[in-house]
């Protein structure tokens, strides 16, 4: 009897597992083993696929070939008992396109209120990805045990913290990989489930916040408690991107290492131009909290949102507010690269009723003023970009008296 | 594969120094962090501080500030421990490991004595 | 800085048998710590980093649990090669610190 040759050839990559599938075409012919070839672009000759020769089920591993994963192969297929079928020839395939993308490892620190997701790929030195390995970005989906309800985080890298958690709560989370540049998704990672720890003594610090004064920047945060020590890291921003080996080498900023206060003051040129991520620490000499929210910090942005320089003219009944670049030393005007509004407050000199004008121009009128009144007036600059969403902190207040009545023209 | 060989057993007279040298392979010293642990004796594990071999940032334990210095030449791929004003007690066996994030002190070298006697 | 303490600080046992070691850290540490099997002579080997986690060839029988200041080391069925001595350690604050010990040896 002639054997028929197998049908339905399925090929599935994940990451550098090469897997074939196939079914048997005649169920009833028992003690038959299949074999495969393969045949590289551009050849003629067919080769017997190494891991696929004589094999008595209907599924072979060939991850041990060696293949240039963007080469387009072919792949045949027969089965032998005393004869042999004819050749069933698989459609042919390029293994990096074919590919997806497999679990990602995951490891899980805990905090009280936090959790610390350190995140690598499945296969290490993977050659299928070895050009992309700096690529993958992931998204994990994360819930309580308790309740079930997910909540779906993209675009994160290789090591994600999660804040604003319960303490001794359990929670759940599975990731997935993705390298968007080939339009891959990849398979989620089993469940992964770490409890948090009992809430710590004393809170990380909250409300971190940079600004500029004169050649300096002055770091603010605020804090439950008194009489505490406070210490300041930074890290360059693009190193969270980095798969790396998963250490990252935070700093200490000298002028901010075991401060009293609630603030400390660096001089600019501790940092080079740059995105820098922020976190602070306290300590009242027995316990240390867990390092606070990591803060983005852009020297670009940071430089130039300055609280903006201003002239006041005034009339009986108006201000009108000529807003400038603000000055660096040396009075040489700060150049500005973004779109800004400007937020200018002005009350009475001997009133505390503060009013407000949000304005995008550089020439504002503050109008409904009384004749021969002292009021005084301070701005601030607000970047208009969402995603940066960064402040300059207000000028000093200027105060100007207007004009006698009748001499609004 | 990871190593980390340390230099041999020293014998030192009390108030002198003592140097140990660390010398890394199969990995990249200037991507993690030294860190020195000492032991006595049928004792425990004391740590004695850590240095950042890329740019020689280092944090000592409080009871050997000012009596060691922790520096490194990457060009070699080798730490070194050096301990000054020894005393009898400073009689132990030094250990350099590798620290690896919350992979904690994943490789160790294989010990150097120091002995401190007149 | 952050106070360990183990117990027992030592203890007798048969191959076979189930041991568990106990940390405490006189601070919460969150999951930042490591566990070591010391044998006389050698250096310290690492078992166990981020409270439960197994380095590659650590056999499954060492395994780790707990949280924020309670921590422990379970050996599920102790093997001839398993008597020596045991070391917790935070990673969480500077300076790093071990716990004092606990000596495992044969009954």
């Known amino acids: 009897k002639n054997l028929k040759s197998p049908q339905k050839v399925e090929v599935d990559i994940i990451d550098d597992n090469f897997i074939l599938r196939w079914n048997r075409s005649d169920e009833s012919v028992g003690n038959v083993t299949f074999s495969f070839d393969y045949q590289k672009t551009g050849m003629d000759n067919w080769i017997k696929l190494s891991g696929c020769q004589n094999i008595t089920s209907t599924k072979c591993n060939f991850s041990s070939l060696k293949l240039n994963v963007y080469e387009e192969i072919k792949l045949r297929i027969r089965a032998e008992k005393e004869n042999t079928s004819s050749w069933y020839e698989v459609d042919s395939f390029t293994p990096f396109r074919k590919a997806q993308i497999g679990p990602p490892e995951v490891h899980l620190e805990a905090e009280d209120k936090a959790i610390v997701i350190h995140i690598s790929p499945g296969t290490k030195d993977s050659v299928m990805w070895a050009l992309d390995g700096l690529s993958f970005t992931y998204s994990l989906v994360i819930w309580k045990n308790s309740s079930g309800v997910e909540e779906r985080i993209e675009n994160i890298y290789s090591r994600h913290k999660i804040y604003k958690l319960s303490p001794e709560t359990t929670y759940c989370l599975k990731v997935k990989a993705a390298l968007l540049t080939s339009w891959k998704i990849g398979v989620y990672s089993p469940v992964h489930c770490i409890k948090t720890t009992v809430e710590n003594e004393l809170p990380p610090p909250e409300n971190i916040e940079v600004s500029v004064q004169n050649q300096n920047y002055v770091l603010k945060w605020d804090y439950t408690y008194a009489n505490m020590t406070f210490q300041v890291q930074w890290l360059h921003a693009f190193l969270k991107r980095n798969p790396g080996n998963h250490l990252y080498k935070w700093k200490q900023i000298p002028d901010c290492e075991n401060v009293k206060t609630t603030q400390c003051v660096f001089p600019q040129n501790v940092f080079q131009k740059g995105i820098y991520l922020l976190r602070v620490q306290a300590s009242d000499g027995n316990n240390t909290s867990f390092w606070s929210e990591e803060i983005k910090f852009d020297t670009e942005i940071q430089a130039f949102l300055l609280p903006p320089v201003f002239n006041i003219r005034s009339l009986s009944d108006s201000f009108h507010i000529y807003i400038g670049a603000p000055k660096q030393s040396g009075n040489t005007p700060v150049i500005q690269d973004y779109p800004l509004i400007y937020e200018i407050i002005f009350w009475e000199n001997t009133s505390n009723a503060e009013r407000k004008i949000i304005e995008k121009k550089t020439d504002v009128t503050v109008p409904n003023l009384k004749p021969l009144t002292v009021y005084c007036v301070k701005a601030r600059a607000h970047t208009m970009d969402e995603k940066l969403n960064k402040s300059s902190v207000f000028s000093d207040a200027v105060c100007e008296k207007t004009k006698p009545g009748n001499t609004s023209k | 594969q990871v190593q980390l060989v340390q230099s041999g057993a020293e014998v030192k007279k009390p108030g002198a120094s003592v140097k140990v040298s660390c010398k890394a392979s199969?990995?990249?010293?200037?991507?993690?962090?030294i860190h020195w642990v000492r032991q006595a004796p049928g004792q425990g594990l004391e740590w004695m501080g850590r240095?950042?071999?890329?740019?020689?940032?280092?944090k000592y334990a409080p009871k050997f500030q000012g009596r060691v210095t922790m520096t490194a030449d990457t060009s070699i791929s080798t730490a070194y421990m050096e301990l000054s004003r020894l005393r009898s007690d400073d009689t132990v066996v030094y250990y350099c490991?590798?620290?690896?994030?919350?992979?904690?002190?994943?490789?160790w070298g294989q010990g150097t004595l120091v002995t401190v006697s007149s | 800085d952050i106070q360990m303490t183990q117990s027992p600080s030592s203890l007798s046992t048969s191959v076979g048998d189930r041991v568990t070691i106990t940390c405490k850290t006189s601070?919460?540490?969150?999951?930042?710590v490591a566990w070591y099997q010391q044998k006389p002579g050698k250096a310290p080997k690492p078992l166990i980093y981020?409270?439960?986690y197994r380095y590659s060839g650590v056999p499954s029988r060492f395994s780790g649990s707990g949280s924020g200041t309670d921590f422990t080391l379970t050996i599920s069925s102790v093997q001839p090669e398993d008597f020596a001595t045991y070391y917790c350690?935070?990673?969480?604050?500077?300076?790093?610190?071990f716990g004092p010990g606990t000596k495992l040896d044969i009954k």
């Open positions: 350690h935070q990673y969480f604050s500077y300076p790093y610190t």
């Open positions: 981020s409270t439960s």
């Open positions: 490991a590798r620290y690896h994030g919350y992979w904690a002190l994943d490789y």
């Open positions: 199969g990995f990249n010293i200037k991507d993690y962090y």
């Open positions: 601070q919460n540490v969150g999951t930042n």
């Open positions: 240095i950042d071999p890329e740019d020689a940032e280092t």
